[in-house]
């Protein structure tokens, strides 16, 4: 396994439909044409996977259909969008990028981007 | 028993098309990088294509490219190389090939492992 | 593409000799290199994988050896069931190449 350099934001605020997007970016030393993506969230030392999606070089990533994240690849990069974010999602969203295939395998894990997300306040009812 | 077993080759005239099948047991096609190579007669060893084990990523020799798609389907446990426009120049025996590594191993281990038999492919007027 | 030049392209040596085969990469593979065997009318079967790790149940007669651009695959004392040709290839850039082979015979 070779290491690998992967950037991303250091902070992003969702909006307040609960979206946050944000570009992460690997400095490719091979000539992979298959690599995967996966976003992890760090909360309290817990590490869990949002989501993950294998790609070509060249094409369009592709999520599962129940998937919370969506993304497109240009090049070295790719952009990224988690959807459907409350308060409680609030963490850090590491991204972490594997060129699978062919040989060499590389491994990249960027430092994590602080996702805030503030709940909107619910609209006061208004008499008339 | 591990195998694979090609079928789909004949004759055919230029310009025409064939679609050949590679059909795996004992192992799951899904869980492997595959790929098709070719053999004039006579001739060395010609790599066509590879398929990545999620579908999503495809890879052909400048030769076949545009001409040639591989696919697969996973309920069939099958590999399939649909040839068009073939050419004279196409003609060679061809072999389905599992690369050893499985596609989530930590082992980064490669090479092809499992070859079928070969199906030959004629094209002729 | 990587161009894979293997030399000789046929040799013929008696029972019991040492054979060597050469495979020179136009570029840095690392030792992402391997060795088929080939006899006539069968497909290929892999003997060496990453440039010197010897397949599961092949005799270890067999050897490879090198890095980077030159690589050797070597048989220790040639048998009659050796007969056949012998392929290297890299495994690191699309689109995988093969060298032109080295047909083995006996004297």
């Known amino acids: 396994c070779k290491a690998m350099h992967v950037a991303q934001p250091a902070v992003v605020l969702a909006s307040s439909r609960g979206i946050a997007s944000f570009v992460c970016e690997y400095a490719s030393p091979g000539k992979a044409t298959e690599v995967r993506v996966t976003v992890l969230r760090q909360a309290d030392s817990q590490v869990t996977e949002v989501c993950a999606a294998t790609y070509m070089m060249g094409n369009e990533l592709t999520f599962l259909d129940d998937s919370i994240c969506t993304g497109t690849s240009s090049g070295n990069q790719v952009n990224l969008t988690i959807q459907g974010l409350r308060a409680m999602d609030t963490g850090l969203y590491i991204c972490k990028v594997e060129l699978m295939y062919p040989p060499p395998y590389y491994l990249g894990i960027g430092n994590g981007t602080q996702i805030y997300v503030i709940d909107p306040e619910p609209c006061p009812d208004s008499d008339f | 028993e591990v195998q694979l077993v090609e079928s789909g080759g004949g004759l055919v005239q230029p310009g025409g098309s064939l679609r050949l099948s590679c059909a795996a047991s004992g192992f799951t096609v899904s869980s492997y990088y595959m790929h098709w190579v070719r053999q004039a007669p006579g001739k060395g060893l010609e790599w066509v294509s590879y398929?990545?084990?999620?579908?999503?990523?495809?890879y052909y020799a400048d030769s076949v490219k545009g001409r040639f798609t591989i696919s697969r389907d996973n309920s069939k446990n099958t590999l399939y190389l649909q040839m068009n426009s073939l050419r004279a120049e196409d003609t060679a025996v061809y072999y389905c090939?599992?690369?050893?590594?499985?596609?989530?191993?930590?082992?980064?281990?490669?090479?092809?492992?499992?070859w079928g038999q070969g199906t030959l492919v004629t094209v002729s007027s | 593409d990587i161009q894979m030049t293997q030399s000789p392209s046929s040799l013929s040596a008696s029972v019991g000799d040492r054979v060597t085969i050469t495979c020179q990469a136009s570029q840095d593979i690392s030792n992402y290199l391997n060795w088929y065997q080939q006899k006539p009318g069968k497909a290929p079967k892999l003997l060496i994988y990453d440039a010197s790790n010897l397949e599961t149940g092949v005799p270890s007669r067999f050897s490879g050896s090198g890095s980077g651009t030159d690589f050797t695959f070597t048989i220790s004392s040639l048998q009659p069931e050796d007969i056949a040709t012998y392929y290297c290839q890299q495994h690191t850039n699309f689109p995988f190449t093969f060298g032109q082979g080295t047909k083995v015979e006996i004297k």
């Open positions: 090939a599992r690369d050893r590594m499985l596609v989530d191993s930590v082992n980064r281990v490669f090479g092809f492992d499992v």
């Open positions: 398929i990545s084990g999620s579908g999503s990523s495809t």
